[in-house]
Amino acid sequence: KDITVKSGAKKDTKDSAPKLPQTLSRGWGDQLIWTQTYEEALYKSKTSNKPLMIIHHLDECPHSQALKKVFAENKEIQKLAEQFVLLNLVYETTDKHLSPDGQYVPRIIFVDPSLTVRADITGRYSNRLYAYEPSDIALLLDNMKKALKLLKTEL
């Protein structure tokens, strides 16, 4: 879903069943620790020397919903995610580096603790480099492992 040119950002939430108040996980992994803002996430990544994984999604996007279920139910993904600073966003930040090829959802971007956006860690779709589908969960796992190999190791 490309939320810059399509209706994703204007979804009418009345079409969805009422949900209980959600934690910061928004269903992406209730046992994980999630940050609230991009600024907080960057600070935690830098100070903890852990890479940051940012998931851009929308509640009213079928592909966000589908990826979320697979992500949350995959034990390997959930275990590996413990080694990241985690942030999921249902809005766009002002940082253009987080949308190198557009503001579509779902997309997953990795940021190194050196605060370098890992634009080199991509999915399999040439027209949406940071998109993942449920069938891409093994690739996402591989990419998480790549992101854990930091660009610059602090001494």
Partner: antibody, heavy 120, light 107 residues
């Protein structure tokens, strides 16, 4: 192999309710989206909504939001479509259709359909 | 909601001929389009998903192409059992929507 077996035809009066079932087998029930689609006599297909049996999350077509309820029972690997305050225009064949095997949204397998007739 | 327009409404062809069915979306749907075949009194059968991926068990004479707004289902050489109604479906955004269908009939 994957099977979706729906309940039998129903004849109901206007204002009544009906609950159509779709019993599944041959795959991990809780990990595939289940869609419901309807087809009025001689007409095309309309998407009603979907449910994720793992946690009961749903999303409805706004047109069907008020009187249509999707539910799932993991203990018997069955999803349900309940329609209340039935109207003559609800007369249709109702299909359940499973999402992709990997959790993707596309519709892969279909039930045989359940005819619901609403008539006084 | 996204509107899918199928054309032609009816296609009259003979067995062995090539069938080309069109489905146009009212906005960009990436490649999130499926094709279904339906015969009278039966449930639809899924042929293609993600615009061009053939479902297991579907004969190779069926193929799908396109992305964005324009999509095509091609049946390379019609078999007698292929005469039916064909529907496209977009699952890019809610609500999912179907095209109005194309009836492929024997000429």
């Amino acid at each position: 192999q994957v099977q979706l077996v729906q309940s039998g035809s129903e004849l109901k009066k206007p204002g009544a309710s009906v609950k159509v079932s779709c019993k599944t087998s041959g795959y991990v029930f809780s990990r595939s989206w289940m869609n419901w689609v309807r087809q009025a006599p001689g007409q095309g297909l309309e998407w009603i909504g979907w449910i994720y049996p793992g946690d009961g999350d749903t999303n409805y077509n706004g047109k069907f939001k008020d009187r249509f309820v999707l539910s799932a029972d993991k203990s018997v690997s069955t999803v349900y479509l309940q329609i209340s305050s039935l109207k003559a225009e609800d007369t249709a064949v109702y299909f359940c259709a499973r999402g992709g095997y990997d959790g993707s949204p596309w519709l892969s397998y279909w039930g045989q359909g359940t005819l619901v007739t609403v008539s006084s | 909601e996204i509107v899918l327009t199928q054309s032609p409404a009816t296609l009259s062809l003979s067995p062995g001929e090539r069938a080309t069915l069109s489905c146009k979306a009212s906005q960009d749907i990436n490649s999130y389009l499926s094709w279904f075949q339906q015969k009278p009194g039966q449930a639809p059968r899924t042929l293609i998903y993600r615009a061009n991926r053939l479902v297991d068990g579907i004969p190779a004479r069926f193929s799908g192409s396109g992305s964005g707004q324009d999509f095509t289902l091609t049946i390379s050489s019609l078999e007698p059992e292929d005469f039916a109604v064909y529907y496209c479906l977009q699952y890019d955004e809610f609500p999912f929507t179907f095209g109005g269908g194309t009836k492929v009939e024997i000429k």
